[in-house]
Interface confidence: medium
Amino acid sequence: DIIMRPSCAPGWFYHKSNCYGYFRKLRNWSDAELECQSYGNGAHLASILSLKEASTIAEYISGYQRSQPIWIGLHDPQKRQQWQWIDGAMYLYRSWSGKSMGGNKHCAEMSSNNNFLTWSSNECNKRQHFLCKYRP
């Protein structure tokens, strides 16, 4: 049998059953999530569920830039340090940097300080690039 690899939308990249879109547009976290949803296919800000997935994403983004943090789909909606993925994925894999989680920082970004492999919390109103994800 020939197994066809699913195709992603133009400008998105494929990895292990998912399509990812890196958008170099400045959006706050909620507007980034709305924009991801607007692309259809059930897209949301990206969940990152393994080191392998994180490494693949990091390598892709590093080909574009290495200095600007990027929103992902992890947030703390109740503001009680109860983090959850916006796409409903289980919050098992964690890759927080050593930075403090305090203050009014309830949305997660991939940090440029460690080549996008670790996460930091930031103010959700901050406007940054963002990463979307969907399963084709």
């Epitope: 547009k25 400045l26 706050n28 909620s30 709305l34 600007q68 103010e123 406007r127």
Partner: antibody
Framework: QVQLQQSGPRLVKPSQTLSLTCTVS??????????WSWIRQLPGKGLEWIGY???????YYNPPLKSRVTMSVDTSKNQFSLNLSSVTAADTAVYYC???????????????WGRGTMVTVSS | QSVLTQPPSVSAAPGQKVTISCSGS????????VSWYQQHPGKAPKLMIY???KRPSGVPDRFSGSKSGNSASLDISGLQSEDEADYYC???????????FGTGTKLTVL
């Protein structure tokens, strides 16, 4: 070519609410991913950023003004608005609406401006 | 009171070059992009430089921007009478979580 047309009263009484509207022509307020800002200039002074709004309705206000500022957007009319409550004489200024350039890296870079509305706060 | 400090005024003769400085801190100029605006009396500001050194279309190449550490500069060469205006630098401030304009500089072409 995008143009921003401002409207609203030029005289407001102290303690009342200043209300201004900016109507966008030559482009849709809900397309292109632009953020829309209000900026003011006190008489003989420099520029002060008030805040921005996105077509989704999400806002960010300059912290010193945050408690008195409300912005809204009406995509059907292609316009966005500023309300500044509890005004005093210190709020007398020229108020500008502006559109951000919308690039990949820069934020709050204003490439299109309204002509400005001189608002006087006086009884 | 803005934390982006500019000289109140500068002046030079037509054809000369002038530099307008903008001094800030790590939390604004040091860590963020700088833009520059020109404002003629009674008019709305006009974007002249963004991302430290980029010029929007229509802005003459006599205008150039640069940044070093926590300070930025706007250079105007080959001064012309129409360059006489107020100039403002601008940048986001990470500590204040607000967007700042500089104190403004009045350029006089002698």
């Amino acid at each position: 070519q995008v143009q921003l047309q401002q409207s609203g009263p030029r005289l407001v009484k102290p303690s009342q609410t200043l209300s201004l509207t900016c109507t966008v022509s030559g482009g849709s307020i809900s397309r292109g991913g632009y953020y829309w800002s209000w900026i003011r200039q006190l008489p003989g002074k420099g520029l002060e950023w008030i805040g921005y709004i996105y077509h989704s309705g999400s806002t960010y206000y300059n912290p010193p003004l945050k408690s008195r500022v409300t912005m809204s957007v009406d995509t059907s009319k292609n316009q966005f608005s500023l309300n500044l409550s509890s005004v005093t004489a210190a709020d007398t200024a020229v108020y500008y609406c502006a559109r951000e350039k919308g690039g990949d890296w820069e934020q709050l870079v204003f490439d299109h401006w309204g002509r400005g509305t001189m608002v006087t706060v006086s009884s | 009171q803005s934390v982006l400090t500019q000289p109140p005024s500068v002046s030079a003769a037509p054809g000369q070059k002038v530099t307008i400085s903008c001094s800030g801190s790590t939390s604004n100029i040091g860590n963020n992009y700088v833009s520059w605006y020109q404002q003629h009396p009674g008019k709305a500001p006009k974007l002249m430089i963004y991302d430290v050194s980029k010029r929007p279309s229509g802005v003459p190449d006599r205008f150039s921007g640069s940044k070093s550490g926590n300070s930025a500069s706007l250079d105007i060469s080959g001064l012309q009478s129409e360059d006489e205006a107020d100039y403002y630098c601008a940048a986001w401030d990470d500590s204040l979580s607000e967007f700042l304009f500089g104190t403004g500089t009045k350029l006089t072409v002698l």
